[in-house]
Each structure stands twice: as structure tokens, then as C-alpha cells.
């Protein structure tokens, strides 16, 4: 399939101009190769009319140009002074005309409307509102006012001042007579349909002295905006339908065969199953505008999308709409998703998130996709040291291993953690990948005590039991904080007795805290890794209390409390519910994200600038 994309149909009127944009994958070769616009002949050839190498056919001399925009991967053909002879089938393409790297475009140039003298032309978008103004003289001020539509040779009454409304206009038309000072009446038609287009006649009075005014109403079907995105990337549809529909249900639908438009998502809670986990409908602004983000684009997502407003939450005649034609380029560098990562209750997962490796300095984020409320993705953690309050002690985002991949570790898993998560950055918004966490049957591999209490000034030893399967892995203990997990010294105490059917290769590795202070209170993780690739982790909360009796504390598995189902947080922590991935434009002004965070979360830690080497192999 050709990766070149453009408008399938272009319609215009004699004398007007058109601008045709064609998209191509912006590879180095494509950016510099020849671009052309040619007309298809009856026998299958394609005659060049204009090219990027300076050629212009005599038919286009002085009225056309072709401009390449290599940085965007587009070129634009402008054609002026159109005539009906320009109607036909064309191709825009790259390279040689016959090579197949092209897109078929149909251009239809129609005759301009033959209008009567003194005709006012109203050009309005489908679904919108038109106000037809009808002047009259003083002598007709008290007489019947009416609007007719010319159907063939006959005028058909649409509305009049005695209260008549043509059934085709019921519920969407009114006739307003201005105050006595103004000799004008107006007819307002809402929710315009394509069938409303045509010639109208306003009339005040019914005799030979009546005042008449001709109006030509043109109802425009919205030209679809062309959207060219990479397979597995993201697309954002910004839908601005105007304040008059601010309180009406909104929808995004995809046109299937004929006039059908299948709802993708709407504000009434409907969502197509094919978009589960990969779509967000962002809350609308006061003016009624909203946006829809779809990530993990698939081949079958290509097509025509309409957004609109209607109380049913789906396309109906007269819905104001916006249109897009989405092309999905299969020559993509973005990895496939969703990745499915499996974890067990009580255990952990280490999720590897891809990002555009050109953007290593970008801020990394991880959010939980929620299907409720039309899809939203509240942030859970970022690479600047912010962690959502409910995830304190069990979630960390690490820049490692780097070079196009970052790591998110989540432990103390419960069935509530199952679901879709998004990996994203404040850089390339096309790189939003989904990962699905599944909670499967099984036991955590690492065994640690539940909550542990240390005594001020004493020594605390906390065990972590590693089964044989991790014999070839690095084992570590670290202290969790908002910016990562700082590595701590630990002791290998030899084989563990915590596993059945496990030989000398099992290990008991202990964390020792000497002369415990208040600063030692917090979450500690033991885990396994391979260089900068992180594996399983287990978390222990160490509380610190005043001395009761002398001696050091050695915590065993049996003596430990059961891990609490919920972590109880300080009153100093507040949930940041407003920190959600909504409008991706937010990332254009990073300050907006930072401000929300700083105001909402008093616990923000400063960012640790040291590399993992400087921190003695810590996880930051």
C-alpha cells in the first residue's frame, strides 16, 4: 500500500482556487526526491502538470505552483482560475509518475450558481444556524411576512407570520419581526441539513405592492481535515463545534459503509470495544470544544471520522459536525502495543516503556487508563520525582536502561492494579504506548516480612528470601523515595530455608540498619536486576519507635505482621486527582503540569541529579 496520502475528492466552483496537500513519510530520501501532480489519462498514463523540479505544463502556466515542506512531510499544489475543464482524476506523488508512490485525487469543478439580481448568498456549514434577513417597506409593516423555498418551478411556503411551519422545518425554524424602528424581519433556521440548500424568497405583503428579496442558501458539508499518523502512534482530534452546542452530548464516530457512522466514543458513556484502553475523551471547555486522543493506532483505524453534537450522542441529520480523514502510515518506528505484563497478587511488575530515543531529556510519565467518564488517564508517577499519594512506597519510575526505554516498577500488587497503563513523555505526543497489567495466579517469588518496627538507636536486620531461580541475578536492597530507590549495603547470609525444593542456590540477603534514627523510617525494597534491567521487587515498611528494651532486632518472616491491605498515609499527603493526561497540548507548556503538581502535592522531593553510578548503583 502506498504511504502517500491526500484528499480523495476536491470540489470547487469555476473561477475559484484550490489548495491540495499531499503527505509522505518524511524519510531523508523522500524529503529530497521529486514531487509531482499529474492528470490521469483514459488509457492509464499520467501526464505531469507540475513538479518540484520546476516543470509547469502550459495548461497551468501562471495559475499553479507546487511547494514542498520537507520538515512536515507534505507538499502543496495550488491551482487558481479553475474551469470545468480542470475536472478529472489526478495523482500526487513522489519519484517517477509510474512508480506507484502516489495518491489518487478526484477534482470536481462545477459551474457557479446562476443567481437572480439582488440575491443575497448565505454560505453556512452543515448543522449550523443561518439567519436570512428580509427588508420591507413601511406600508407592509402590518402585513403577512413569509419565506418560500423554490422547488423546481414552484415556490413552497416554509414559514409565515401567522404561525405556519413547513413540516420539514419543524422544531428548527423561527420568524422574528424586529422592533417597529427596523423595517426588517428575519428567519432563523437551526441544525441546517444538506437538503435545506437552495433558492429562497422572502416576502412582506401578498399583493402587487409586496416587498420581495431573493436568498441563495449554500449548505457546506465540512471538507475533511487530512490527518497523517504512524502505525502504533497517536492521533488527537480537536473538535470545536461552537458555544451554541456547549450543553449538547458530543460524539466521535467513524464512517463505515454508506452514510453509517459508528460511534467511537461519546459523552453519554458509549465507547467502541476496539478502542478499549487506548482512547480518551477529554473534558470539554466552556465553549463546548473537546478533544479525543486515540493511541496505539492500527491499520483498521484509518478512515473518515466525524465529531458532532446531538442529544442522542450519535450522528443525526442536522448535527453540527467536523470531519477528518485519517491515514495510517505503516512505515512506522513506533513499537507495537499493548504489551501484556503479568504479575501475581502481592508481587510486582517492572514495565519497560518505549519512548522516542531522540528525546532522552523529556519528562517521562505513567498513567492509569480509566474507562469511566469517557476515558481518562490520571498520572501516577513522573521522572521529576512526583508520585501520586496512594502509590507512595510501591511505585517508581526510573530513567534506566535509557536510550529509548524507561522502567516503571509497581509492587504490592492487588487485583485492583489490573488494567491498561499508558507510557508517555512531554516530548513526542505520538509516542503514547499502552501496557496491560494482568494479575495471574501464583505466589510472589521474593519473601519479606510484613510491616517491621525498628527501635531508635538499635540495630535492625530485615531479611529478604530469594528463590533459586534468581541465582544468576544481582540482588539488592534500597530505600524508596519519590525520585527512585537509593541502593543500600546488604549481606548475603547464605541459602534460605524459606523455599521447598530449593537447593543451595536460594539466598537470604539481609538489610542491616545500624543505630536506627527517625530518618530510617519508610519503605524499603529488596529486588533483583540485571544491570539496568529491573526484575521483581518486594516492599517492607519500617516504622521507628522509642526504645522499650535493650538489644538489636532481627526480624523473621514468622514474626512479621501481615502486610496491610491499604497503606495509611500522613495527613500531609493529598491526592492529585486533577493531574490527569487530558489535553496533550498541556505538554507544550510544561509549566502547566509542574504548577498543578507543586500546588497539589506538598510532599514533592527535589530531583536527584546524580547518575546511577554516582549513587552506588541505585535505581536512579
Amino acid at each position: 500500500k502506498s504511504p502517500i496520502f491526500g484528499p480523495e475528492e476536491v470540489n470547487s466552483v469555476e473561477g475559484n482556487s484550490v489548495s491540495i496537500t499531499c503527505y509522505y513519510p518524511p524519510t531523508s530520501v523522500n524529503r529530497h526526491t521529486r514531487k509531482y501532480w499529474c492528470r490521469q489519462g483514459a488509457r492509464g498514463g499520467c501526464i505531469t502538470l507540475i513538479s518540484s523540479e520546476g516543470y509547469v505544463s502550459s495548461k497551468y502556466a501562471g495559475r499553479a505552483n507546487l511547494t514542498n515542506f520537507p520538515e512536515n512531510g507534505t507538499f502543496v499544489v495550488n491551482i487558481a482560475q479553475l474551469s470545468q475543464d480542470d475536472s478529472g482524476r489526478y495523482k500526487c506523488g513522489l519519484g517517477i509518475n509510474s512508480r506507484g508512490l502516489s495518491f489518487d485525487v478526484s477534482l470536481e469543478v462545477s459551474q457557479g450558481p446562476g443567481l437572480l439580481n439582488d440575491t443575497k448568498v448565505y454560505t453556512v456549514d452543515l448543522g449550523r444556524t443561518v439567519t436570512i434577513n428580509c427588508p420591507f417597506k413601511t406600508e407592509n409593516a402590518q402585513k403577512r411576512k413569509s419565506l418560500y423555498k423554490q422547488i423546481g418551478l414552484y415556490p413552497v411556503l416554509v414559514i409565515d407570520s401567522s404561525g405556519y411551519v413547513n413540516p420539514n422545518y419543524t422544531g428548527r425554524i423561527r420568524l422574528d419581526i424586529q422592533g417597529t424602528g427596523q423595517l426588517l424581519f428575519s428567519v432563523v433556521i437551526n441544525q441546517l441539513r444538506l437538503s435545506d440548500a437552495g433558492q429562497y424568497l422572502c416576502q412582506a405583503g401578498d399583493d402587487s405592492n409586496s416587498n420581495k428579496k431573493n436568498a441563495d442558501l449554500q449548505v457546506l458539508k465540512p471538507e475533511p481535515e487530512l490527518v497523517y499518523e504512524d502505525l502504533r502512534g497517536s492521533v488527537t482530534f480537536h473538535c470545536a463545534l461552537g458555544p451554541e452546542v456547549a450543553n449538547v452530548a458530543k460524539f466521535l464516530c467513524r464512517q463505515s459503509s454508506g452514510e453509517n457512522c459508528d460511534v467511537v466514543v461519546n459523552t453519554l458513556g458509549k465507547r467502541a470495544p476496539a478502542f478499549e484502553g487506548r482512547i480518551l475523551l477529554n473534558p470539554q471547555d466552556k465553549d463546548g470544544s473537546f478533544s479525543v486522543v486515540i493511541t496505539g493506532l492500527r491499520k483498521e483505524d484509518a478512515g473518515r471520522y466525524l465529531c458532532g453534537a446531538h442529544s442522542d450522542g450519535q450522528l443525526q441529520e442536522g448535527s453540527p459536525i467536523q470531519a477528518w480523514q485519517l491515514f495510517v502510515n505503516e512505515e512506522s518506528t513506533i513499537p507495537r502495543s499493548p504489551t501484556v505484563v503479568k504479575g501475581v497478587a502481592g508481587g510486582s511488575v517492572a514495565v519497560l516503556c518505549p519512548y522516542n530515543r531522540k528525546e532522552s531529556k523529556s519528562i517521562k510519565y505513567w498513567c492509569l487508563w480509566e474507562g469511566a467518564q469517557n476515558g481518562r488517564c490520571p498520572l501516577l508517577v513522573d521522572s521529576e520525582g512526583w508520585v501520586k499519594a496512594q502509590y507512595e512506597g510501591r511505585l517508581s519510575l526510573l530513567e534506566e536502561p535509557g536510550n529509548g526505554t524507561f522502567t516503571v516498577i509497581l509492587n504490592q500488587l492487588t487485583s485492583r492494579d489490573a488494567g491498561f497503563y499508558w507510557c508517555l513523555t512531554n516530548g513526542d505526543t505520538l509516542w503514547r504506548t499502552t501496557v496491560e497489567i494482568k494479575i495471574i495466579e501464583g505466589e510472589p517469588n521474593l519473601k519479606v516480612p510484613g510491616n517491621v518496627t525498628a527501635v531508635l538507636g538499635e540495630t535492625l536486620k530485615v531479611p529478604c528470601h530469594f528463590p533459586c531461580k534468581f541465582s544468576s541475578y544481582e540482588k539488592y536492597w534500597c530505600k524508596w523515595n519519590n525520585t527512585g530507590c537509593q541502593a543500600l549495603p546488604s549481606q548475603d547470609e547464605g541459602p534460605s530455608k524459606a523455599f521447598v525444593n530449593c537447593d543451595e542456590n536460594s539466598r537470604l540477603v539481609s538489610l542491616t540498619l545500624n543505630l536506627v534514627t527517625r530518618a530510617d523510617e519508610g519503605w524499603y525494597w529488596c529486588g533483583v536486576k540485571q544491570g539496568h534491567f529491573y526484575g521483581e521487587t518486594a516492599a517492607v515498611y519500617v516504622a521507628v519507635e522509642e526504645r522499650k528494651a535493650a538489644g538489636s532486632r532481627d526480624v523473621s518472616l514468622a514474626k512479621a505482621d501481615a502486610a496491610p491491605d491499604e497503606k495509611v498515609l500522613d495527613s500531609g499527603f493529598r491526592e492529585i486527582e486533577n493531574k490527569a493526561i487530558q489535553d496533550p497540548r498541556l505538554f507544550a507548556e510544561e509549566k502547566a503540569v509542574a504548577d498543578t503538581r507543586d500546588q497539589a502535592d506538598g510532599s514533592r522531593a527535589s530531583v536527584d541529579s546524580g547518575s546511577s553510578e554516582e549513587q552506588g548503583g541505585s535505581s536512579r
Partner: nanobody
Framework: QVQLVESGGGLVQAGGSLRLSCAAS????????MGWFRQAPGKEREFAAV????????HYADSVKGRFTISRDNAKNTVYLQMNSLKPEDTAVYYC?????????WGQGTQVTVSS
């Protein structure tokens, strides 16, 4: 779901080379980190090498560092392990794994035997 099939194993003399391949079926191969593990008779399965989705980062067990190279071709849904300077102690069944640091998806394994 990812299915993995290893190939390329066999009998080789010490100092020789082999190239293992792991072909993946399933739409999402290119988003997974991939790893190679090995299991010698009577021993635990041990880690050998891992590579990120884009090949941007790799890591090797000390025992194979400098001799083995992991690579991948996402267009072919395949991950490779180039094994040079083979030693008798490299004799094992070699397994390919998707998402090797969590609960991996495993292949069936391919036998590598290094004779002295």
C-alpha cells in the same frame, strides 16, 4: 499472546561459534524486551542476555560477556544470540524469553552442546 520458537542449536567444538534465532509470532513482539536464558543439566535456568525493544540497551551475564551478542530484527519478529569462543561449560538448553524480567513468555528451548 506471544509464541516463541528457538532454532540454531547443535553440536560445536570448543572455540567455535553458533547463532541462535528466536522467531516470535504475535502482533506485539516489537514492544517487548527479549532475553536469552540457559539451563545446564541439573542446574537452575540462568540469565544470559537481554535487549530492549529497539536494541538501544543490552545487558549480559558476566559468564558470557565479551563472547555473546544479543540482537533483534523487529521487521522479522526475531531475536538472535551470536555465541563466539564457545566453551564446554556453555553446554545447555537455551531458551528465548519475552518480557524476561517479569513473568516471561518462554520458548521450548534449543540444545547447544560444546565438545572439548
Amino acid at each position: 499472546q506471544v509464541q516463541l520458537v528457538e532454532s540454531g542449536g547443535g553440536l560445536v567444538q570448543a572455540g567455535g561459534s553458533l547463532r541462535l534465532s528466536c522467531a516470535a509470532s504475535g502482533r506485539t513482539f516489537s514492544s517487548y524486551a527479549m532475553g536469552w536464558f540457559r539451563q545446564a543439566p541439573g542446574k537452575e535456568r540462568e540469565f544470559a542476555a537481554v535487549i530492549t525493544w529497539n536494541g538501544g540497551s543490552t545487558h549480559y551475564a558476566d559468564s558470557v560477556k565479551g563472547r555473546f551478542t544479543i540482537s533483534r530484527d523487529n521487521a522479522k519478529n526475531t531475536v538472535y544470540l551470536q555465541m563466539n569462543s564457545l566453551k564446554p561449560e556453555d553446554t545447555a538448553v537455551y531458551y528465548c524469553a519475552a518480557d524476561p524480567m517479569n513473568s516471561p513468555y518462554w520458548g521450548q528451548g534449543t540444545q547447544v552442546t560444546v565438545s572439548s
